[in-house]
Interface confidence: low
């Protein structure tokens, strides 16, 4: 067996905290394990001789959003058992080749996931847009915690918005689940939504949602 | 406008408790507290922070296992405790609003004073 | 983890522009916020992220950061400036202060 080859390119993907790191290259005569560090600093071994050139961690980062995660991908030599119905970690005593993650802080890292225009409510003359608080595969207490509850005031929308048959648009930035606006009688208004997050350097922005209109509003005096 | 006010000046004596606190005047949940220490006359250093709505915490390594970091939401009031203060713990010490390298609103600090 | 590190003082005469520096490795790629001491007070919060200033600081302060240096910049600057300045920044779990440095106003 030759020399196994050390991962490259590992790269971190994760939205809404669900993450994934890949790497390359596809193993030949070897298999990959990954270990991820946890809050006490120990190393935990997941994705164990594996020859997929990906590793789903969200298990471990969801147990601490806020904590700087660190990685490693060892490239481990493989021979047939004595049964011949697995593969063992051949180490001689010795680390194998690894090759080290980029630190991977969830909550500062994680892409925001596309927002979803949940419904529109009018009040009066205003009216109200709602933006889906999505789930995340955040836990506490056994059940999932919406982006809004995991992000809190850190979360923001960008809303921007049109009258339907205008070229104008308008922005406006809401660190709520909500936004209102002024409408005029009959006419239809169309929003496209971005999440954000405040606080951070890059990865501030969500995709947009798909663009929702509003159907023509009815006459405000009951006509 | 937010404000944080924290508890008056304490003189302590080695080996004594002391718990100081930090009460908030805006919706105290939904933000983070964090605490700086100042020792006379150098810079500052941060200690540890708080997310009241649910009492997570986390500590720098420096201060790990020598404080405790509470919070009481219900009065929107968090604290500073240590369990047998030593002289080295002479310091001011700030409690601020936090979020991740960002202190953007400190209370007027507490000033400990531990001597025999 | 990153270490921040700031002259210990810097000296400007009035209305002349003081910068002050804050460098880390690779301290470009963290945001940095500053904050301004004042004898018996509090710190204020005088640039976050870099280059963003809160409501009710001047103008005059501005911040920048790349590669492995951020610069908090005075301009114009005036008495009521002398103070310590401290740089800070987020890593690895953990908030990390630069050394502080005292700002002079001849």
């Known amino acids: 067996a030759g020399i196994p080859e050390k991962a490259f390119n590992l790269t971190w993907i994760s939205t809404d905290f669900k993450t994934i790191l890949e790497w390359q290259p596809k193993p030949t005569n070897y298999t990959y394990t990954v270990q991820i560090s946890d809050r006490s600093r120990n190393w935990k071994n997941k994705c164990f001789s594996t020859t997929d050139t990906e590793c789903d961690l969200t298990d471990e980062i969801v147990k601490d959003v806020t904590w700087a995660y660190e990685a490693k991908v060892l490239s481990v030599p493989r021979r047939n058992s004595v049964h011949g119905d697995g593969d063992q970690l051949v180490i001689h005593g010795e680390e194998p080749p690894f090759t080290n993650a980029p630190k991977f802080l969830p909550y500062r890292d994680t892409n925001l996931g596309q927002p979803v225009i949940q419904q529109f409510e009018q009040d009066g003359r205003k009216l109200n847009v709602v933006v889906k608080d999505s789930l995340t595969l955040v836990r506490k207490n056994g059940t999932f915690l919406t982006l809004r509850q995991v992000f809190g005031k850190d979360l923001g929308y960008i809303i921007t918005y049109r009258k339907g048959s205008s070229t104008g648009k308008k922005t406006n930035i809401t660190n709520t689940n909500e936004f209102s606006i002024d409408v005029e009688e009959g006419v239809s208004y169309c929003f496209f939504v971005q999440a954000m997050i405040f606080s951070r350097k890059t990865n501030q922005n969500s995709p947009g949602s798909s663009t929702v209109c509003t159907e023509q509003w009815k006459s405000f005096l009951g006509e | 406008q937010v404000q944080l006010v924290q508890s008056g000046a304490e003189v302590k004596k080695p080996g004594e408790s002391l718990k100081i606190s930090c009460k908030g005047s805006?919706?105290?949940?939904?933000?983070?507290i964090g605490w700086v220490r100042q020792m006379p006359g150098k810079g500052l250093e941060w200690m540890g922070w708080?997310?009241?709505?649910?009492?997570?915490?986390r500590y720098s390594p420096s201060f790990q296992g020598q404080v405790t970091i509470s919070a009481d939401k219900s009065i929107s009031t968090a604290y500073l405790q240590w369990s047998s203060l030593k002289a080295s713990d002479t310091a001011m010490y700030y409690c601020?609003?936090?979020?991740?390298?960002?202190?953007?609103?400190w209370g007027q600090g507490t000033l400990v004073t531990v001597s025999s | 983890d990153i270490e921040l590190t700031q002259p210990p003082s810097v000296s400007v005469a009035p209305g002349q522009t003081a910068r002050i520096s804050c460098s880390g490795d690779?301290?470009?790629?963290?945001?940095v916020s500053w904050y301004q001491q004042k004898p018996g007070q509090a710190p204020v919060l005088v640039i976050y992220?870099?280059?963003n200033r809160p409501s009710g600081i001047p103008e005059r302060f501005s911040g920048s950061n790349s590669g492995n240096t951020a610069t908090l910049t005075i301009s114009g600057t005036q008495a009521e400036d002398e103070a310590d300045y401290y740089c800070?920044?987020?890593?690895?779990?953990?908030?990390?202060f630069g050394g502080g440095t005292k700002l002079t106003v001849l």
């Open positions: 800070a920044t987020y890593d690895s779990s953990t908030d990390v």
């Open positions: 805006y919706s105290f949940t939904s933000n983070w």
């Open positions: 708080i997310y009241p709505s649910d009492s997570m915490t």
């Open positions: 601020a609003r936090y979020l991740f390298g960002l202190f953007d609103n």
């Open positions: 690779n301290l470009g790629s963290y945001y």
């Open positions: 992220n870099d280059n």
